[in-house]
């Protein structure tokens, strides 16, 4: 997250970190069910661990943390690497979470976002770009949903209805390491960090997010079919 600020503790209990060995963060994710995460489809990896209830990026033990293995990864059938359409994936955890103040699912919004809606994006991704500099703790950033026209103007021929753009002033954006993390609007999960320009936070080049309102049926049916 570029030019965000430290999230208040316990305010993002659905935020997950996807880790490679040894404790290498590569993506964020979101708890949407006691045993299921949502993340970006481009975050698919064979072997990874899931960390929930953790505030700092470092692997130091925190009393609220819960660690899991991903036992099943189900990318949306319409996703094709390295494209950006349909960029979502469900991950089944090896067991159900223990609900606490630090670990709790969030509901996926069935309503599509309208321009001007205020949202919060969070993650442990780099706070500088193109340099790489990781934060000590989870970062939060207020962003506003942009109209689909502004989105298409920013990225001609690259936007479809499985995506929406959101941004704030120039210099504020999600970035590498934030993929798959939550965009929360009005208390529900509206999007996932997906893609954007490189370096991040360029003027008139907003972040692009997976438009989850288009996928509520697929999410529900996939969880039911695999539970």
């Amino acid at each position: 997250i570029i030019n965000g600020s430290d999230c208040d503790m316990h305010t993002q209990p659905w935020q997950a970190a996807l880790l490679l060995r040894p404790n290498q963060l590569y993506c964020g994710a979101v708890l949407v069910h006691p045993q299921w995460l949502l993340t970006a489809a481009h975050c698919r990896k064979k072997v990874f661990r899931v960390r929930l209830g953790h505030y700092s990026l470092s692997p130091v033990y925190e009393s609220g943390q819960q660690m899991f293995q991903g036992v099943k990864s189900i990318p949306h059938p319409g996703y094709s690497h390295p494209g950006h359409s349909n960029d979502l994936m469900l991950i089944k955890l090896n067991r159900r979470i223990r609900p606490t103040k630090d670990v709790r699912p969030i509901n996926v919004s069935s309503h599509c976002p309208s321009a001007g809606t205020k949202c919060l994006v969070s993650g442990w991704g780099t706070t500088k770009s193109p340099q790489v500099h990781f934060p000590k703790v989870l970062q939060c950033l207020n962003i506003s949903v942009l109209s689909q026209k502004r989105c298409e103007d920013a990225y001609p021929r690259q936007i479809d209805d499985t995506m929406f753009c959101a941004g704030d002033k120039a210099g504020r954006d999600s970035c590498q390491g934030d993929s798959g993390g939550p965009v929360v609007c009005n208390g529900s999960l509206q999007g996932l960090v997906s893609w954007g320009d490189y370096p991040c936070a360029r003027p008139n080049r907003p972040g692009v997010y997976t438009n989850l309102c288009k996928f509520t049926k697929w999410i529900q049916e996939t969880i039911q079919a695999n539970s």
Epitope: Y26, H42, K45, P82, V132, Q176, W195, R205
Partner: antibody, heavy 126, light 107 residues
Framework: EVQLVESGGGLVQPGGSLRLSCAAS????????MNWVRQAPGKGLEWVSY????????YYADSVKGRFTISRDNAKNSLYLQMNSLRAEDTAVYYC???????????????????WGQGTTVTVSS | DIQMTQSPSSVSASVGDRVTITCRAS??????LAWYQQKPGKAPKLLIY???SLQSGVPSRFSGSGSGTDFTLTISSLQPEDFATYYC?????????FGGGTKVEIK
């Protein structure tokens, strides 16, 4: 079959210009970032330039900055390298290479160059 | 710029030998290192990405390890087709930089 084929190399005098082309086939060219990498005779690999899938991000090695221009035409599945003010030290085999990393994607994960052309030879000599 | 230093610059080995090549980055690059194989007159071929992940179609006798600044490419049992030059490359930071190469020759 996934393939990259370079062309446009040749003999040119110092100070001259050349335009290299790289024709891509067998994959969705418009989805991938691309690179030019060169190799001087008997030497190692030297990265020259990078261009993102939509051409919004471009990088050059310091040794070619201000003299070389990378571009692409996604409609033609083609990558280009315009080389001006050529010097003897630019003599090399030039490869185009597909970058597996999408710098647009916001994961923190990097791959490498997974598909390379056969190379085209540029000789700068008087 | 990040400097990549490979060692040794050449190694003589026999079929069946275990060969180890090292690569050192001038600053930490996490796990973001790729290894390539190049045979004379041919283009480089990606062997390993993210320091230890084997590229599709590459034999399992090739393996990579390391993180931060120190990385290793190991060929567990050298085969005749493995005699070539090997390069490491750091990929997260522009300008991308390669190591100087290690030539694996027949003893």
């Amino acid at each position: 079959e996934v393939q990259l084929v370079e062309s446009g190399g040749g003999l040119v005098q110092p100070g001259g210009s050349l335009r290299l082309s790289c024709a891509a086939s067998g994959f969705t060219f418009s989805s991938y970032s691309m690179n030019w990498v060169r190799q001087a005779p008997g030497k190692g690999l030297e990265w020259v330039s990078y261009i993102s899938s939509s051409s919004s991000t471009i990088y050059y090695a310091d040794s070619v900055k201000g003299r070389f221009t990378i571009s692409r035409d996604n409609a033609k599945n083609s990558l280009y390298l315009q080389m001006n003010s050529l010097r003897a030290e630019d003599t090399a085999v030039y490869y185009c290479a597909r970058d597996l990393t999408s710098m647009q994607s916001r994961d923190y994960y990097y791959y490498g160059m997974d598909v390379w052309g056969q190379g085209t030879t540029v000789t700068v000599s008087s | 710029d990040i400097q990549m230093t490979q060692s040794p610059s050449s190694v003589s080995a026999s079929v069946g030998d275990r060969v180890t090549i090292t690569c050192r980055a001038s600053q930490g690059i996490s796990s973001w290192l790729a290894w390539y194989q190049q045979k004379p007159g041919k283009a480089p071929k990606l062997l390993i990405y993210a320091a230890s992940s084997l590229q599709s179609g590459v034999p399992s006798r090739f393996s990579g390890s390391g993180s931060g600044t120190d990385f290793t490419l190991t060929i567990s049992s050298l085969q005749p087709e493995d005699f070539a030059t090997y390069y490491c490359q750091q990929v997260p930071i522009f300008p991308y930089t390669f190591g100087g190469g290690t030539k694996v020759e027949i003893k």
